[in-house]
């Protein structure tokens, strides 16, 4: 079970966005296949994407186990048509990952507004919850469990007939905000973690929703 | 080390035009929002406007709207204040702060300010 | 546009006095208040945040404390380099609104 003419992985990159997270690499195979190996800084061992011929391996199961925990990841190449065989002492060449955090360093998913109710000159608008694969006592947590207050969002809101943003913050998924009565709205929001330090700290903005539209309600 | 500066201040006449620049290092303002404060001579601190380097969105406030637009140039970790149609009541320091978006914190950091005046 | 109504203007304190400055806002912010001290010349420096939590390398000297729309800002016991102006600042909501400023001068 030689290795010769295989070639170790590079790039090898995280992409994760609310802990769905899968490992990147190259190159496209050419007469190899890779086998994907996750464990935390203390833990063993465990193999994933066994002889694959694709460059990304899904590791969501492994780091939802413990979001907090810091993970690395290697990636093996073999040659095409290898079977795993007992009496091989050749390793394979593989590389590292870089370490990857999910907790510090998965991407805020782009948030939705899920309703927006207005009473007199009041609004409440409500953001929806993500589920996340996160699991608690065998129940998948929401974005909201996993961050709690760690986790705030931004609205903008704006009158359909102007262009200056005001914003609103909350720690919570609602926002109670005043607004002048007759006048129609628009409002997007952004899920931050401001106690992030990296570029990972902000999602992108959600879809503008107005009032006057479907999501919306209105009552005296 | 996170830091601010301003740059640009001087003295114009009313009705003139000014571009203030705050230039950020130690961070990336697209992950943050800019706010742009200033402080008459004497007097106390007054909010102008903010921008959100990721979106673009700006609010000012009510007695420079119109006349003062606030941009950012995340390539070159900078935000702008554009002055236009000063009067003498613009007369001010004018500070930039870095705002977290946190539910908790305000202004976190503020640059050294730049002095603006307007007289003839 | 929320106004924050800071008290007093001014006062006069020894070094070792204890030092009260108290913000009214006119609605509901819930806890989304920072202090600032800000000395001539200088940009405003953040104290407090949220009301009541003393921001990284603030003395302990220092504290602040709410009770619905009155915010209050606590120094125990004055030492020579807080003399200077202090500011609130609600940022509840857009725009943020600043108190008048209350400058501790040395009696």
């Known amino acids: 079970s030689g290795t010769t003419n295989t070639v170790a992985a590079y790039n090898l990159t995280w992409k994760s966005t609310n802990f769905k997270t899968i490992l990147e690499w190259e190159p496209k195979p050419i007469n190899q296949v890779y086998t994907v190996q996750i464990s935390t800084k203390s833990g063993d061992w465990k193999s994933k994407c066994f002889y694959t011929a694709d460059t990304e391996c899904d590791l969501t199961d492994e780091i939802v186990k413990d979001v907090k925990q810091t993970y690395l990841a290697r990636v093996f190449s073999y040659p095409a048509g290898h079977v795993e065989s007992t009496g091989s002492t050749e390793e394979p060449p593989y590389e590292n990952s870089p370490e990857f955090t999910p907790y510090l360093e998965t991407n805020l998913g782009q948030p939705t507004i899920q309703s927006f109710e207005q009473v007199g000159t009041k609004v409440n608008v409500t953001v929806q919850d993500e589920w996340t694969l996160v699991r608690r006592n065998d129940t998948f947590l929401s974005l909201r469990d996993v961050f709690g207050k760690d986790l705030i969002y931004t609205l903008y809101y704006w009158k359909s007939s102007s262009s200056g943003k005001k914003t609103a913050k909350t720690n919570t998924n609602e926002f109670l905000i005043d607004v002048d009565k007759g006048e129609n709205y628009c409002f997007s929001v952004q899920a931050v973690i401001p106690s992030r330090r990296t570029a990972n700290r902000k999602s992108t903005d959600s879809p503008v929703e107005c009032m006057g539209h479907e999501k919306g309600e209105s009552r005296e | 080390e996170v830091q601010l500066v301003e740059s640009g201040g001087g003295l114009v006449q009313p009705g003139g035009s000014l571009r203030l620049s705050c230039a950020a290092s130690g961070f990336t303002i697209s992950d943050y929002v800019i706010h742009w404060v200033r402080q008459a001579p004497g007097k106390g601190l007054e909010w102008v406007g903010y921008i959100d380097p990721s979106n673009g969105y700006t609010y000012y406030a009510d007695p420079v709207k119109g006349r003062f637009t606030i941009s950012a140039d995340t390539s070159k970790n900078t935000a702008y204040l554009q002055m236009n149609s000063l009067r003498a009541e613009d007369t001010a320091v004018y500070y930039c702060?870095?705002?977290?978006?946190?539910?908790?914190?305000?202004?976190?950091?503020w640059g050294q300010g730049t002095l603006v005046t307007v007289s003839s | 546009d929320i106004q924050m109504t800071q008290s007093p203007s001014s006062l006069s304190a020894s070094v070792g006095d204890r030092v009260t400055i108290t913000c009214r806002a006119s609605?509901?912010?819930?806890?989304?208040v920072a202090w600032y001290q800000q000395k001539p010349g200088k940009a405003p420096k953040l104290l407090i945040y949220s009301a009541s939590f003393l921001y990284s390398g603030v003395p302990s000297r220092f504290s602040g404390s709410r009770s619905g729309t009155d915010f209050t800002l606590t120094i125990s016991s004055l030492q020579p380099e807080d003399f200077a102006t202090y500011y609130c600042?609600?940022?509840?909501?857009?725009?943020?609104?600043f108190g008048q400023g209350t400058k501790v001068e040395i009696k």
């Open positions: 600042q609600q940022h509840y909501t857009t725009p943020p609104t």
């Open positions: 702060a870095r705002d977290p978006q946190s539910f908790y914190i305000a202004f976190d950091y």
């Open positions: 609605q509901d912010v819930n806890t989304a």
